[in-house]
């Protein structure tokens, strides 16, 4: 059962796992949610009736029954983790805490103009978990405007105290706001020889990398595969760090794999969701339950639905015994990973999918798969929407992309002459324009947010957000696309597609069926040569064939240039402008979305 509200002046008795410090009950709830075992918590707020050493304590708790006895206690705030909830969860915390000093290891001290600058510094520093900033009014002259970057083993403060004229806050890495590089490569036959901060068991290097990503101290990892010569180290995932933030030594060793934390890419690839099945593999751990199940998929479902289950092993039925049902062992451990992994015993193992809701919805795999384009199939581009204007008659105006459950990203130039959002309708999950009838459901537009530097498409900033009047329920035919990570600026996308209902030649009509065309990206230098009269800025991205033939065209504006990278689709561009359509040496010009990620997040996350 999902309980989101906090219980004031209430303490849960017993069930303690560990105690951490958090600046608020709300953040205590987030920490509990991300902890592998925590189901309930009790937070102690600052209060004259409480011992100051207990202020800001966040006690993480577990219970076999998923609840604990309640006791009245002033200043105590209790609640449940969001593990029991089905909604999307984020660790992003943009709050600034006034007059609080969050203690940790102060490893960097520098002058900053503002708390915001200090927070940005923390976000772009690989080690930083949180910061404290002494304001201009701080009594000690030599400490004024000092920005202290801090880290701890747990990622949360070791203590929190009241201190006048300082502010504290957390790194915004989990808000996708870091400019740190996103290195997705896994290096085979490589061992990173740096200090281990922790070690866990993992079935493969990908799971090891994802565990490293959401471990607060892990910057890179080494994984020993099941073929590793030393038996006791097989399937061992070593979580590592270094002072520089990079591995100091790389040793060539067969059957080992190494890689980096994906913390700078976590909004565009799954980092919590381990969805694979591991055949002929047994996960050992504390047994929670043994249930009969028809298949390993059914066993995974049972584990996902049991809130305390972290991983499972399924043993298929022997011959016709037990109505063809096998045994499903639901398991857990102190850290969410198996205590041991065994091979060759015939089991099929995997993890709960409950953690998938901590990943961005946009990372969900979709069905496999304009000018010179071909017709799409239903559900192939579930983020693509058709934006209609109803004045004076209803018709398709532009494309757009779902990027959140209340947000469409599109082009600013689509709103030339549009005096009110009332005349706009957003249709999602549409393949053919002919599906749209008078009674077809649509999303009304509450607000049009145009970039305030936009003047005209050809000079850039051709980007706009539509805030919908109601939220989109994600399904196979309507779901969001990931924004590119800022750490992905150097990624070379090779699988890019433009989609839309636009014209197939310069003078044509809106197409009935959503068209798609695979189009290669063109460097900005090359693009600039083709548009000498224009300034192709770094905030634009171009795509097209030298010989022409395939391109976006009129009616495709605002729609996506979608690129697939590491099995996840990213919204790399927004269809904007170009000379003619599909002309030789005239690439299409798109808004370069990665350059607007901050703007998008600022607008969509505004309170």
């Amino acid at each position: 059962e999902c309980v989101t509200q906090l219980l004031k002046d209430t303490c849960f008795e017993g069930g303690d796992i560990t105690t951490v410090f958090t600046p608020s009950a709300k953040y205590c709830q987030v920490v509990c949610t991300y902890h592998p075992r925590c189901l309930l918590f009790t937070f102690t707020a600052e209060s004259p009736s409480e011992d100051p050493t207990r202020w800001f304590t966040c006690v993480l708790k577990d219970s076999v029954t998923e609840t604990l006895p309640r006791v009245n206690r002033t200043a105590a705030i209790s609640g449940y983790s969001f593990k029991q909830c089905s909604h999307q969860i984020s660790a992003c915390n943009k709050d600034i805490y006034v007059d609080l000093d969050m203690k940790g290891i102060n490893y960097n001290s520098s002058v900053a103009k503002s708390a915001q600058e200090c927070q940005e510094r923390c976000t772009d520093d690989v080690h930083c978990h949180f910061f404290t900033y002494a304001t201009r009014q701080f009594p000690s002259l030599e400490h004024r405007n000092i920005c202290l970057l801090k880290h701890t083993q747990t990622g949360t403060p070791t203590r929190i105290t009241k201190l006048d004229k300082v502010v504290s806050g957390f790194s915004l890495k989990s808000c996708a706001l870091s400019n740190l590089a996103c290195i997705r490569d896994i290096f085979p036959n490589t061992v990173f020889a740096d200090s281990n901060i922790d070690s866990v068991m993992a079935p493969d290097a990908f799971v090891c990398g994802r565990i490293c990503t959401h471990h607060p101290g892990c910057l890179f990892f080494t994984f020993f595969s099941q073929e590793w010569p030393k038996e006791s180290q097989r399937n061992l995932c070593l979580l590592k760090t270094s002072e520089s933030g990079l591995p100091s030594t790389r040793i060539k060793k067969s059957k080992a794999l190494s890689g980096f934390s994906l913390q700078s890419c976590r909004h565009s690839i799954p980092v919590f969701c381990h969805s694979s099945f591991y055949h002929d593999t047994d996960f050992l751990g504390e047994e929670l339950d043994i249930v009969a199940a028809k298949s390993h998929e059914a066993c995974q479902k049972l584990c996902t639905n049991a809130v305390r289950c972290q991983f499972f092993t399924y043993t298929p039925a022997q011959a016709s015994c037990n109505e063809g049902k096998g045994k499903c062992y639901l398991k857990l451990s102190s850290n969410g990973s198996p205590t041991k992994i065994l091979h060759g015993r015939g089991g099929i193992s995997g993890y709960t999918l409950r953690l998938c809701k901590m990943d961005n919805e946009c990372t969900t795999k979709i069905k496999p798969r304009i000018v010179g384009g071909t017709a799409s199939v239903r559900g192939e581009w579930p983020w693509q929407v058709t934006l209609h204007t109803t004045s004076p008659t209803q018709r398709h105006l532009c494309g757009g992309s779902i990027i959140g459950n209340q947000w469409i990203l599109t082009a600013a130039h689509c709103f030339y002459g549009v005096e009110s959002p009332k005349i706009l309708r957003v249709y999602s999950g549409i393949l053919n324009q002919s599906e749209i009838k008078e009674d077809t459901s649509f999303f009304g537009v509450q607000e049009i947010i145009i970039h305030d530097q936009y003047k005209m498409a050809e000079s850039g900033y051709d980007i706009a957000l539509l805030k919908l009047e109601t939220t989109v329920n994600y399904t196979d035919s309507q779901r969001p696309i990931c924004l590119p990570s800022k750490g992905d600026r150097n990624v070379i996308y090779t699988d890019c597609w433009v989609t839309g209902w636009g014209y197939r030649k310069l003078r044509d009509k809106i197409q009935n069926t959503l068209q798609k065309a695979k189009i290669p990206l063109v460097t900005n230098e090359e693009c600039q040569k083709r548009y000498r009269g224009h300034k192709i800025t770094h905030k634009m991205i171009c795509a097209g064939y030298r010989e022409g033939g395939k391109d976006a065209c009129k009616g495709d504006s605002g729609g996506p240039l979608s690129c697939k990278h590491n099995e996840v689709w990213h919204l790399v561009g927004i269809t904007s402008w170009g000379e003619g359509c599909a002309q030789r040496e005239r690439p299409g010009v798109y808004t370069n979305v990665v350059e607007y990620v901050d703007w998008i997040l600022e607008k969509t996350q505004a309170v």
């Epitope: 498409a457 000079s459 636009g502 402008w577 002309q583």
Partner: antibody
């Protein structure tokens, strides 16, 4: 202020040539398609020619094809119309106009800015 | 070429009255149609683009409608300065064509 200023009109004999210019200011010239439209005395508007933003594509009315050449110099923000083999029926006020064509929404934006016109008289 | 035919050639109305001007294309021009106003001795001025969208600075009394082959320009309540010649123009074909114009005169 967005402005188009035509020049180069005048009196010319049949068979003669004339080069009209249109100086653009107050906007990014290279972003717009440009065109020439003429109006004979007491008559309606007649489209003459259009040119794409880069100058790579040109179109002409049948009545002037082979005799007139449209061109542009984006570095000088200027549109030209070279008129050869002029005839009496080419006598008109010649307007230059801009047209927004590079954006990829399906709307036709029309000729939203016009010059004041320059008069061409073809007479012996 | 796509022919554009405007009717009537002349329309006599009084200030405050409603004016309805018609334009017909010889084949579909989708919504690639614009309307222009030309006052005596002046350059044309864009009124309506894309068949039905009012250009910047054009009063709300001007409205356009239609799509395909039949288009209408409506002036809901004539003002003295509205008496002028009105042209429709298509750009669906790369050979642009104008209608012959409708002269709106004071009755």
């Amino acid at each position: 202020e967005v402005q188009l200023l035509e020049s180069g009109g005048g009196l010319v004999q049949p068979g003669g040539s004339l080069r009209l210019s249109c100086a653009a200011s107050g906007f990014t010239f290279s972003t717009y398609s440009m065109g020439w439209v003429r109006q004979a005395p007491g008559k309606g508007l007649e489209w003459v020619s259009s040119i794409s933003p880069s100058g790579g594509d040109t179109d002409y009315a049948d009545s002037v094809k082979g005799r007139f050449t449209i061109s542009r110099d984006n570095s000088k923000n200027t549109l030209y119309l070279q008129m050869n083999s002029l005839r009496a029926e080419d006598t008109a006020v010649y307007y230059c106009a801009r047209e927004r064509t590079m954006v990829r929404d399906p709307r036709y934006y029309g000729m939203d800015v016009w010059g004041q016109g320059t008069t061409v008289t073809v007479s012996s | 070429d796509i022919q554009m035919t405007q009717s009537p050639a002349t329309l006599s109305l009084s200030p405050g009255e409603r004016a309805t001007l018609s334009c017909r294309a010889s084949q579909s021009v989708s919504s690639y149609l614009a309307w222009y106003q030309q006052r005596l001795g002046q350059s044309p001025r864009l009124l309506i683009y894309d068949a039905s969208s009012r250009a910047t600075g054009i009063p709300a009394r001007f409205s356009g409608s239609g799509s395909g082959t039949d288009f209408t320009l409506t002036i809901s309540s004539l003002q003295p300065k509205d008496f002028a010649t009105y042209y429709c123009q298509q750009s669906y074909s790369n050979l642009v064509t104008f209608g012959q114009g409708t002269r709106l005169e004071i009755k």
